[in-house]
């Protein structure tokens, strides 16, 4: 029995396994919600602080089935997308389409992914082969990075990859702390 | 330093049940799985089940259902396992071992040192 | 599910040969997701080799892993003594996740 008959009414990305690309900025899927997230008191003149967490911005959850080939995951997965830009904490909206969208006239604020987190998938394959284990990152938070004049779009792709990048002198979270050889690999998976 | 300490030997009569620890330290407790591993006596390692802390999320091996119960409590960083109905083929060492969080691969990097349980009359 | 065969399940060898174990699985397995442990007498194992071919932190260079499909297997350039042990393959590319039965290494 094919995939064809499985109805999906969610947000359907489907990456290679291990690889995530960056979500569009919009989403339209009756699942989506709204938070503002990190907020803050804001500040008087807004960019007269380099504190990021003054600023705040939009989580919105999606649902989406992974596939792996012919195969489809059990049930869908719930993950954030980070979107859009950030505004002080007060002038977010708290839901969609309330209130205006407050956008900048200085350097940018881009919605970024902070944190991630693993979850695994139980891939259901037709042909009665056996369901497989499979991992996948979602995001678990998002945060506002500030990006002057000089940062471009390219930059702004790595953010997600950046974020998930272990920093001397603090652990990141998620990580892993195994292995040599590919030891790169695993300690940089997030 | 990753840590995961277990409680300690368990001596249980038949048909009772028996609930051991494992308490983890030196990482985020809730960014990765937690599996469970049982070894008998001189024998080979069974894939128990494993647990997200995130999100409480359990799977288990189709043997041990109904035998085996994993809960995690986040506020301590402990994971449990209740095994129930106890007879002396569970008799084993029984281990916790962190998964590591990269995507590409399942593997186990940290092992508790083991919870040795004895069923007896 | 998927069975994993060892072997040999025993085997011996002196400081500084070159041995060579093997894993067989009963249907192909993704080769990211086969592990080697470690397991030494009265103690737990360790995550040895990872992906079928990454050692893990602090395993010596002399251990390599190779493998694809049903047939992976676990190498030691030049065994030394620290190297007996039991161990064991894993898949955890199907559910359940399963091991192998080990092979066990005796150094003469």
């Known amino acids: 029995q094919g995939w064809q008959a499985f109805k999906n009414d969610a947000t359907e990305i489907i990456p290679e396994l291990g690889e995530y690309p960056e979500p569009p900025p919009e989403l339209e899927n009756n699942k989506t919600m709204n938070r503002a997230e990190n907020g803050g008191r804001p500040p008087h003149h807004p960019f007269e602080t380099k504190d990021v967490s003054e600023y705040s911005c939009r989580e919105l959850h999606f649902t989406r089935y992974v596939t792996d080939g012919p195969c489809r995951s059990a049930k869908p997965v719930t993950e954030l997308v980070c979107s859009g830009q950030c505004g002080p904490a007060r002038l977010l909206p708290n839901a969609i389409g309330r209130g205006k969208w407050w956008r900048p006239s200085g350097p940018d604020f881009r919605c970024i992914p902070d944190r991630y987190r693993a979850q695994r998938v139980q891939l259901l394959c037709p042909g009665g082969e056996a369901p497989r284990a499979r991992k996948v990152r979602l995001v678990a938070s998002c945060k506002c990075k500030r990006l002057t004049r000089f940062h471009n779009q390219s930059e702004l792709k790595d953010f997600g990859t950046e974020a998930a990048r272990p920093q001397k002198g603090r652990k990141p979270r998620p990580r892993a702390r195994s292995a040599k050889a590919n030891q790169a690999e695993l300690e940089n998976a997030y | 330093e990753v840590q995961l300490q277990q409680s300690g030997p368990e001596l249980v009569k038949p048909g009772a049940s028996v609930k051991m620890s494992c308490k983890a330290s030196?990482?985020?407790?809730?960014?990765?799985?937690m599996n469970w591993v049982k070894q008998s006596h001189g024998e080979s390692l069974e894939w128990i089940g494993d647990i997200n802390p995130y999100n409480d999320d359990t799977t288990y091996n189709h043997k041990f259902k109904g035998k085996a119960t994993l809960t995690v409590d986040k506020s301590s960083n402990t994971a449990y396992m209740q095994l129930n109905s106890l007879t002396s083929e569970d008799s084993a060492v029984y281990y916790c071992a962190r998964e590591t969080a990269v995507i590409t691969t399942n593997a186990m990097d940290y092992w508790g040192q083991g919870t040795s349980v004895t069923v007896s009359s | 599910q998927i069975v994993l065969t060892q072997s040999p399940a025993i085997m011996s060898a002196s400081p500084g040969e070159k041995v060579t174990m093997t894993c067989r699985a009963s249907s192909s397995v993704t080769s990211s997701y086969l592990n080697w442990y470690q397991q030494k007498p009265g103690s737990s194992p360790k995550l040895w080799i990872y992906?079928?071919?990454n050692l893990a932190s602090g395993v010596p260079a002399r251990f390599s892993g190779s493998g694809s499909g049903t047939s992976y297997s676990l190498t030691i350039s030049s065994v030394e003594a620290e190297d007996a042990a039991t161990y064991y393959c894993q898949q955890y590319d199907f559910f359940p996740s399963t091991f192998g039965g080990g092979t066990k290494l005796e150094i003469k």
């Open positions: 992906s079928t071919s």
């Open positions: 030196g990482y985020t407790f809730t960014d990765y799985y």
